[in-house]
Structures are given as structure tokens and as C-alpha cells.
């Protein structure tokens, strides 16, 4: 009976999410493998988040709006492990917008989800950020490593969206 009611709840939750995400990829997790964590297909998952790499070239504002429509934000990177996971799926000759910007050009960087900007957990390339006119951040491959660079927000780039996993 307990299992039956849990299955019914899951199905109704799945139907609810299906309006927004036609297909979900779910894995069983938790102490008793009773919880399912899901990401929209074909998003990838790492820890408690889902990631989508958009190859559409758009300005930073349009990229953020695009993520927002999918229930996500431009990616907020919190750890080196997270960055290493993300970069496995990126092309080394491309640049991708992050959810990091400095709209006033005062070098007051801010994450789109209001996560406090911690200078100690940043992965800027050497010499970056280097211009108050370049108010949006990208991640790109330079000098044999992935790192961040400040760029002009209005110039189209690829982007990375991030959302919390869906638990059912």
C-alpha cells in the first residue's frame, strides 16, 4: 500500500513536470534507493544540479533569458570540481557565458542567483578580468587550461544553463 501510494505520487509529479520538460532522465538515490533525482533530457547531472550547454550564439542577457525560460539560470560555478565536470563537455575552441556579470563596470561581480561572489573561489585566467567595459564572464580554454575571462555582454557567445535537480 505504501509503495503504491508513493508510485501514484511520483506519477502525478512526473505529469506535472511533463508540461515543462517532455522527457526526464531519472536515477534512484538516497539511503534506501527510494528517491529519484531527475534532469531534463538531454541535460547532464552533477551532484544536486543539472546542466545544459547551449550552442546558440546569443548576447549575455538573451542567454540568461533563454535559461530562465527553461527554469534555469546561466551557470553559477561554486567549486573546482563543478568546473571540471562542466568543462568535460565543452569544446576547447569555444567560449561560453557564465552567470557572472558586473553591470556597472565597477568590478563588483555578481552571480545571477545572488550567490555571494567569493574572490577565493574564482577561476579567472591570468590577467583577467581586465576591462571595465567587459562586464560579462565567459569560460574558455586558454594556455592549456579552462578559466574565466571578462568580455562584452552584447557580443553573442554560447552558454551554459544550470538548474536544481528535480526530486520525485
Amino acid at each position: 500500500n505504501f509503495m503504491y501510494s508513493k508510485t501514484v505520487k511520483r506519477l502525478s509529479k512526473l505529469q506535472e513536470y511533463q508540461q515543462y520538460y517532455p522527457s526526464l532522465t531519472c536515477v534512484m538515490e538516497g539511503k534506501d534507493m527510494e528517491d529519484w533525482s531527475c534532469c531534463p533530457t538531454p541535460w547532464t547531472s552533477f551532484q544536486s544540479s543539472c546542466y545544459f550547454i547551449s550552442t546558440v550564439m546569443q548576447s549575455w542577457t538573451k542567454s540568461q533569458n533563454n535559461c530562465s525560460v527553461m527554469g534555469a539560470d546561466l551557470v553559477v560555478i561554486n567549486t573546482k570540481e563543478e568546473q571540471d565536470f562542466i568543462t568535460q563537455n565543452l569544446k576547447i575552441n569555444s567560449a561560453y557565458f557564465l552567470g557572472l556579470s558586473d553591470p556597472k563596470g565597477w568590478r563588483h561581480w555578481q552571480w545571477v542567483d545572488q550567490t555571494p561572489y567569493n574572490k577565493n573561489v574564482t577561476f579567472w585566467h591570468s590577467g583577467e578580468p581586465n576591462s571595465p567595459d567587459e562586464r560579462c564572464a565567459i569560460i574558455n580554454f586558454r594556455s592549456e587550461e579552462w578559466g574565466w575571462n571578462d568580455v562584452h555582454c552584447h557580443v553573442p557567445q554560447k552558454s551554459i544553463c544550470k538548474m536544481k535537480k528535480i526530486y520525485i
Epitope: 548576447s59 576591462s131 567595459d133 560579462c136 562584452h152 555582454c153 553573442p156
Partner: antibody
Framework: EVQLVESGGDLVKPGGSLKLSCAAS????????MSWVRQTPDKRLEWVAT????????YYPDSVKGRFTISRDNAKNTLYLQMSSLKSEDTAMYYC??????????????WGQGTTLTVSS | DIVLTQSPASLAVSLGQRATISCRAS??????????MHWYQQKPGQPPKLLIY???NLESGVPARFSGSGSETDFTLNIHPVEEEDAATYFC?????????FGGGTKLEIK
């Protein structure tokens, strides 16, 4: 006082080349992004090229990409536009303009008086 | 590219009256309360001159009779009261994404 003075406009045959210059004064030239904007005979304004303050980025619309090259000499306070494979539709008044960034975009806060390019056989 | 459509193409306004010029964008040029639409004035034989930036901010030295408003896709330039020296062509421009684009212009005549 901010001043931008363009020069180099001329009558050129289709397929020809020309280099425009813009001498800047009255501000710290090296600190600003600069653009070329043209005004066609029917008075429409069209962005042609942008160069960032540090000379690290250049941007062009598809209509001129591969034919026009924007450059700057910060020591001489001068902006350039090298144009090649010119077409009749490139006929216009060419203005150099200073960019001022605002939030996620920018606007053109000073414009030169312009120099005329005519492409005709 | 974002297309900006200005209307009317031309208008004649009596001295001291209000002139209203509209600029409609093919998609939003706003982001979180910032509106990346700008207005320029151009008189015959002169280059464009910046009047208003970011929809409603008056450029230094521009008379207070000029004002701008709007958000997302619809923006307006108002001139009130109109003076003789305001006879000119007015252009809007967006900069939220490359390429920056301009409206086709509105020619203002003073009656």
C-alpha cells in the same frame, strides 16, 4: 572638448580599396571603445565596425565582414577603417563614434562630422 | 538582428506643442529594469547627437524639454514644448545585442 575628425573619403570604383582615418582629441582615446557608423544616401544609419579600448576585440556586421578592418593607434589617438572589395552599396557618409558602456550595452556619445565614400564606376 | 521601427516617419508640430515619436523593437531590449534603447537627434549637414541613453536618461547639456520612456519593446521620445531649433530627424538605437541597430528615423517639422 571631445573632437573626432574623419578623413580619407573619396570616389572609388567597385572592387577598389580605401582607408579612412579618425583623429581623436580631448579625451583619453585608449580608454574607449570606438566604432564606425555609416549613413546611406537614404539617411539610414548602419553600424560598420567596433574596436575595444584595449584593441583586443573587433566586431563587424555580416555585410562588411572579411572586407573591412577596423584598427587603432593609441599612441597617435587615431582610429582607422581599411575597406576593400568595395561595392556600390558601401556608398555612404562614414562617421567615427565614441562608445560609452552602460550596463550590458553601450551608446555612442560623440560623433565626428563624417567623411563621404562614393563607390561608382 | 533586432529591427527597430519608428513612427511616424515624419510629423509637423506647432511651436510650443508636444511632439511624440515612437520606436518599437522586434524583441525586448530590456533586462532586469535596464532598457538599452537610446535616442539621437540629427540636423541637416550634421552628425547625430546623443539626446537620451537607456530609455530615459537625459544626456548632459540636453534641454529638459526632451524626455524618454518605455520598456521591453515600446519606447517613446517626447519633446515639449517644441522649439524652432528642434526641427531635425530623430533616431532610436538598441545595444542589448550585436549588431547595434537603428530605427529608420522620424523627421520633425515645426509649423
Amino acid at each position: 572638448e571631445v573632437q573626432l575628425v574623419e578623413s580619407g573619403g573619396d570616389l572609388v570604383k567597385p572592387g577598389g580599396s580605401l582607408k579612412l582615418s579618425c583623429a581623436a582629441s580631448g579625451f583619453t582615446f585608449s580608454s574607449y571603445g570606438m566604432s564606425w557608423v555609416r549613413q546611406t544616401p537614404d539617411k539610414r544609419l548602419e553600424w560598420v565596425a567596433t574596436i575595444s579600448s584595449g584593441d583586443s576585440y573587433t566586431y563587424y556586421p555580416d555585410s562588411v565582414k572579411g572586407r573591412f578592418t577596423i584598427s587603432r593607434d593609441n599612441a597617435k589617438n587615431t582610429l582607422y577603417l581599411q575597406m576593400s572589395s568595395l561595392k556600390s552599396e558601401d556608398t555612404a557618409m562614414y562617421y567615427c563614434a565614441r562608445q560609452l558602456y552602460y550596463s550590458y550595452g553601450y551608446y555612442f556619445d560623440y560623433w565626428g562630422q563624417g567623411t563621404t565614400l562614393t563607390v561608382s564606376s | 538582428d533586432i529591427v527597430l521601427t519608428q513612427s511616424p516617419a515624419s510629423l509637423a508640430v506647432s511651436l510650443g506643442q508636444r511632439a511624440t515619436i515612437s520606436c518599437r523593437a522586434s524583441e525586448s531590449v530590456s533586462f532586469h529594469g535596464t532598457h538599452l534603447m537610446h535616442w539621437y537627434q540629427q540636423k541637416p549637414g550634421q552628425p547625430p547627437k546623443l539626446l537620451i541613453y537607456a530609455a530615459s536618461n537625459l544626456e548632459s547639456g540636453v534641454p529638459a524639454r526632451f524626455s524618454g520612456s518605455g520598456s521591453e519593446t515600446d519606447f517613446t521620445l517626447n519633446i515639449h514644448p517644441v522649439e524652432e531649433e528642434d526641427a531635425a530627424t530623430y533616431f532610436c538605437q538598441q545595444s542589448i545585442e550585436d549588431p547595434p541597430t537603428f530605427g529608420g528615423g522620424t523627421k520633425l517639422e515645426i509649423k
